[in-house]
């Protein structure tokens, strides 16, 4: 007997599509080697028609393909628009030749039944409603009127004009007559289910006078759509459930064995593990939503079910919408952590990944929110000025080209524990999540700024210095001024990584900036970083205010770290050419602060394109240039 | 919740024919498939045959050891899967149970089944 597994017969009619399994053994070698579906003809010869090396027979262009899933052990053949000439016997098999493992399959293709010739066909969806239509002669108008369902041997009630209503149908069928026309009535339908398909006769009058009419009602469940995601990237599952439902509850589930389950609604319900990686989006007034999960899991695969009901719940006779979800372990997305440790107090440096081919997109970093349908308002954005509250201690670095961005966060606090995505306004697939976890710190901070209650006087010296321990001898450290648009690096003069030391003295690692002489554009925040080529390690941040200098007084630094730092001044400065560009206020990017969805995150964009570059290092100079000087001890 | 309710078992003679009947209520879903397992005396329970349909395609899976001689078929309108059983032999001896699931993988594989009848004893006497 034959290793491989199918279904044996299948059945169909013209204009339909098939969508046949394969199940083989789960061997490396079944797994990697060529998977066809051939013809069998009289001569016992098997003709392929479609293979995994990307052959297509003339017959099946545009309408067939044939997809492994070596993680499942099975193949699909799919065709559509089938005719009866696709009736045959077929093999769907393993092998560089056609004799090698297979499986026969019988494909039967029929013509749609031929039904009585006066017969009207209603074909709907499942959970719509159905309006028929019943004509009938002016002498039958005081007749009674009834609609009944064709059973083998009866013809069984549904409803007639006595108000008599069959049980199954009761507060879903109506009969009525519209306006004053004495010729027609109706009967609608509504909630319909599979088992309301079939043949129905409606009818007005008694004996050989009455009126008759026969009627197909066809229920159609929905086809699933397929969709083919990539590990770790993000799936959108756009549901339109019509007018209707506009006012019901909305829900996303994932059918099992047994039911479906619920993993989003509209009242607030969602699973967990679906946490932080999941938004539902009301997208109008005509029952259109959508849903967005990001960071696709191996085990996000599965068929999905979208509906409508009050009870956020799937329900029997309610309009839905289906998908096939593959998610494709051979990703293009790189496996980046998921999960980001910080303590209080200290600094995350989170590496997004995005579309290389798309270096130029905008780039933003949100904070998921899963209160009510989930949103995820913008912190931070390459033309998205940061949200206030996070002034001082958020920057978002672009490297233009590859592949990454990186979002610092310092100055943590357990109240930043939570899920943030990554995303651009281009390839949407490429959104990622994050969660940060922040512990209360237990030691020391790597970095650590002196003076720590930094007030500079204007037209003077001002010194800061950042401590680093021995493990951050060998990485770039940087001092950079914070804006809302940015971490803008000041130039460095690194003395210290240039020198050859065996020995690490503990005490003495810093790095220095000084502001020489001092301006009222000082005042702000400051970071101290390390960073080892283009990626991002620690932070500190420092908020320098400037005073102008009270009479009498002479301003003293407070450290011999300071007092050290002047001398490194006299012996060489570098000029920063620094300066802020133009603080112009841009609207937030996204979808998000707003709570908009986040699809409208590329189209917002689109619109602040007119604004600055945040983590760069260029910038026009002022009229009177702060002198900055990196030095290490 | 489905209920499944088996019948048409019965003891028959080697060669002779038997039409088993699943009868489906309660919730019933837009996709579905319905199967035949047995059990004999002593031995683990093993698939027969499934139907699976979607709208008006229909799929049917039978076990190696049927050979042509059992149909599985369906009545939409009734809810209801027969299997057909020609040609019977003394070892298709078994209790037959009816199975059924929203959401098919491996048709053979009995944990994809989420619904199961009480079965229904059918004896072939040589």
């Known amino acids: 007997k034959s290793p491989i597994f199918g279904p044996q017969e299948v059945s169909s009619i013209e204009g339909d599509s098939v969508s046949i399994t394969c199940y083989y053994p789960d061997t490396s070698v079944n797994r990697h080697t060529r998977k066809y579906w051939c013809r069998q003809g009289a001569s016992g010869m098997c003709t392929t028609l479609i293979s995994s090396n990307g052959y297509l027979s003339k017959e099946y262009s545009g309408r067939a393909n044939l997809i492994n899933f070596p993680e499942n052990n099975t193949f699909v053949i799919n065709i559509e628009q089938l005719t009866q000439d696709d009736t045959g016997s077929y093999k769907c098999g393993l092998g560089t030749s056609n004799r090698g493992l297979s499986f026969d399959v019988s494909l039967e293709v029929s013509q749609v039944p031929e039904l009585p010739s006066d017969t009207h066909v209603y074909t709907k969806d499942i959970g719509r409603n159905v309006t028929i239509e019943c004509p009938f002669k002016r002498e039958n108008a005081p007749s009674k009127k009834s609609l009944c369902k064709k059973t083998n041997q009866s013809c069984e009630l549904v409803i007639d004009s006595t108000e008599k209503v069959n049980p199954s149908y009761i507060g879903r069928a109506k009969l009525f007559m519209k306006g004053t026309d004495l010729t027609v009535f109706y009967v609608n339908i509504s909630h319909l289910t599979h088992n309301d398909a079939g043949l129905y006769i409606c009818q007005a009058g008694e004996g050989p006078s009455a009126d008759k009419k026969n009627v197909d009602l066809q229920v159609l469940a929905p086809e699933p759509e397929l969709l083919y995601k990539d590990l770790r990237s993000s799936v959108t599952f756009e549901c339109d459930l019509g007018r209707e439902v506009a006012n019901e509850a909305k829900y996303l589930c994932r059918m099992n064995k047994e039911t479906c389950d619920v993993i989003i609604n509209t009242l607030g319900k969602r699973d967990p593990d679906f946490e932080g990686r999941i938004l539902i989006t009301p997208k109008d007034d005509n029952g259109r939503f959508s849903v967005l999960i990001t960071g696709l899991r191996k085990e996000d695969a599965g068929h999905y079910q979208c509906g409508a009901h009050s009870s956020g719940l799937p329900q029997e006779g309610w309009p839905i919408q289906t998908w096939q979800l593959f998610v494709n372990e051979e990703s293009t997305i790189p496996n980046r952590r998921s999960v980001v440790k910080g303590v209080t107090g200290g600094s995350v440096a989170i590496a997004c990944p995005y579309n290389p081919k798309e270096s130029s997109s905008l780039k933003y970093w949100c904070r998921w929110e899963g209160d009510g349908n989930g949103h995820c308002p913008v912190l931070v954005g390459t033309q998205a000025q940061v949200q206030e509250e996070y002034e001082g201690r958020l920057a978002l670095f672009d490297q233009p080209g590859n592949g990454t961005y990186t979002v610092i966060l310092n100055q943590l606090t357990t109240e930043d524990a939570g899920f943030y995505w990554c995303l651009t306004n281009g390839d949407s697939r490429w959104r990622t999540t994050i969660e940060l976890q922040v512990a209360e710190a237990t030691r020391e901070p790597n970095l650590e700024v002196t003076p720590q209650n930094a007030t500079a006087v204007l037209g003077e010296t001002f010194t800061v210095s950042c401590h680093y321990p021995c493990k951050f001898y060998s990485q770039e450290k940087y001092w950079c001024k914070w804006s809302n648009k940015g971490c803008h690096i000041l130039p460095s003069h690194d003395e210290g990584a240039r020198q050859s030391s065996v020995s690490c003295d503990q005490s003495s690692q810093l790095v220095s900036m000084t502001l020489n002489p001092v301006s009222k554009e000082d005042e702000g925040w400051y970071w101290c970083g390390v960073k080892q080529g283009q990626t991002y390690g620690e932070t500190t941040a420092i908020y320098i205010a400037v005073e102008e200098r009270t009479r009498g007084s002479s301003h003293v630094n407070p450290t011999d770290a300071n007092a050290r730092a002047k001398v490194a001044l006299e012996e060489e400065v570098v000029d920063s050419s620094i300066s802020e560009k133009e603080n112009k206020a841009i609207p937030n990017p996204g979808p998000f602060a707003n709570e908009r969805e986040i699809q409208n995150v590329g189209d917002q964009a689109q619109e602040n394109r007119a604004s600055g570059d945040a983590g760069s290092a260029d910038g026009q100079s002022r009229s009177s240039s702060s002198k900055h000087h990196h030095h290490h001890h | 919740q489905v209920q499944l309710v088996e019948s048409g078992g019965g003891l028959v003679q080697a060669g002779d024919s038997l039409r088993l009947s699943c009868a489906a209520s309660?919730?019933?879903?837009?996709?579905?498939?319905m199967g035949w397992f047995r059990q004999a005396p002593g031995k683990e329970r093993e698939f027969v045959a499934t139907?699976?349909?979607?709208?008006?395609?229909?799929?049917?899976y039978y076990a190696d050891f049927v050979k042509g001689r059992f149909t599985i078929s369906r009545d939409n309108a009734k809810n209801t899967v027969y299997l057909q059983m020609d040609s019977l032999k003394p070892e298709d001896t078994a209790v037959y149970y009816c199975?059924?699931?929203?959401?098919?993988?491996?048709?053979?594989?009995?944990?994809?089944?989420?619904?199961w009848g009480q079965g229904t004893q059918v004896t072939v006497s040589s």
């Open positions: 199975a059924a699931t929203t959401l098919l993988g491996d048709p053979r594989a009995l944990n994809e089944y989420a619904y």
């Open positions: 309660g919730r019933t879903f837009p996709t579905y498939a």
């Open positions: 139907i699976r349909w979607s709208g008006s395609t229909q799929y049917k």
